[in-house]
Amino acid sequence: MRRERGRQGDSSSCERQVDRVNLKPCEQHIMQRIMGEQEQYDSYDIRSTRSSDQQQRCCDELNEMENTQRCMCEALQQIMENQCDRLQDRQMVQQFKRELMNLPQQCNFRAPQRCDLDVSGGRC
């Protein structure tokens, strides 16, 4: 499976930027931080791997976007939406959100001031 290439529309829009980047390393980085050695995630074994692998690639991808509050927030919302169904309980959802909001700081970016991570119709 490949990314959709050359999509029409405003190439500077946050949606277009979020669509072009690979957010999977960010998702795995956060899942590893909150799950540690609990279980295998996707088909990739996160139990014995260093989170720095995912973090470096994650930060590189986030760095590809215009460093605006709105675009960063949209990226964080997309990560939350992508992982929502994997989060087993309310506590895990809250942990994930906490780690997600720390992500820009870990990558030395400005964190969005206000970013609503309640996605998927309130499920998360």
Epitope: R2, R5, N22, K24, D42, S43, Y44, D53, R57
Partner: antibody
């Protein structure tokens, strides 16, 4: 047809400079990270440098840091490698490679490679 | 820097046999960032496996990848004449994106 074509190789004396180019065609160049990988005669592959789509993130192998500079021009569909202070051990075939990722699971990989351009550093 | 050590250096087998190539990392590598390439003399490398176990487009199912952490394996179930080449593993999660030194698969 998706293609990468390297050029700019040649014979250069130790301490000299060369600029390699890689012309991309058949795909949206600005959508991909790009890499340079080299292979010394009879040796294995050595990753040299990478540059992200917007040029915001650049990495180098320790062996070339401070001497080589990777750059790209998305408007010209071109990747470059400026090589300064060349040494005998820089003699190699230099490959330009496109990096993609699997959108469903995330892994990265170099899926398209050029045929390479030969750099010989010798006095 | 993550050092990848491939073994054996050379593997001599006959067509039809099973080949098992090893790639060991000096530090743990996420499966997500482990790739295998094939290279034949005078040619550019060719992508075989990414994400440690996913076959690239057009790669026959006799090729399979497995492993996690520091130990990864490329297996060719039944060797075809065109499979004799040099195989490289690479990690691309943490810069510098290192390659193993390669395993040469030769006809016995």
């Amino acid at each position: 047809e998706v293609q990468l074509v390297e050029s700019g190789g040649g014979l250069v004396q130790p301490g000299g400079s060369l600029r390699l180019s890689c012309a991309a065609s058949g795909f949206i160049f600005s959508d991909y990270n790009m890499n340079w990988v080299r292979q010394a005669p009879g040796k294995g592959l050595e990753w040299v440098s990478s540059i992200t789509r917007s040029s915001r993130t650049i990495y180098y192998a320790d062996s070339v840091k401070g001497r080589f500079t990777i750059s790209r021009d998305n408007a010209k569909n071109s990747l470059y490698l400026q090589m300064n202070s060349l040494r005998d051990e820089d003699t190699a075939v230099y490959y330009c490679a496109r990096e993609d990722f699997d959108v469903s699971t995330g892994p990265y990989y170099m899926d398209v490679w050029g045929k390479g351009t030969t750099v010989t550093v010798s006095s | 820097e993550i050092v990848l050590t491939q073994s054996p250096g050379t593997l001599s087998l006959s067509p039809g046999e099973r080949a098992t190539l090893s790639c060991r990392a000096s530090q743990s590598v996420s499966n997500m960032f482990l790739v295998w390439y094939q290279q034949k003399p005078g040619q550019a490398p060719r992508l075989l496996i990414y994400g440690a176990s996913t076959r690239a487009t057009g790669i026959p199912d006799r090729f399979s990848g497995s492993g996690s952490g520091t130990d990864f394996t490329l297996t060719i179930s039944r060797l075809e004449p065109e499979d004799f080449a040099v195989y490289y593993c690479q990690q691309n999660g943490n810069s510098p994106y290192t390659f193993g030194q390669g395993t040469k698969l030769e006809i016995k």
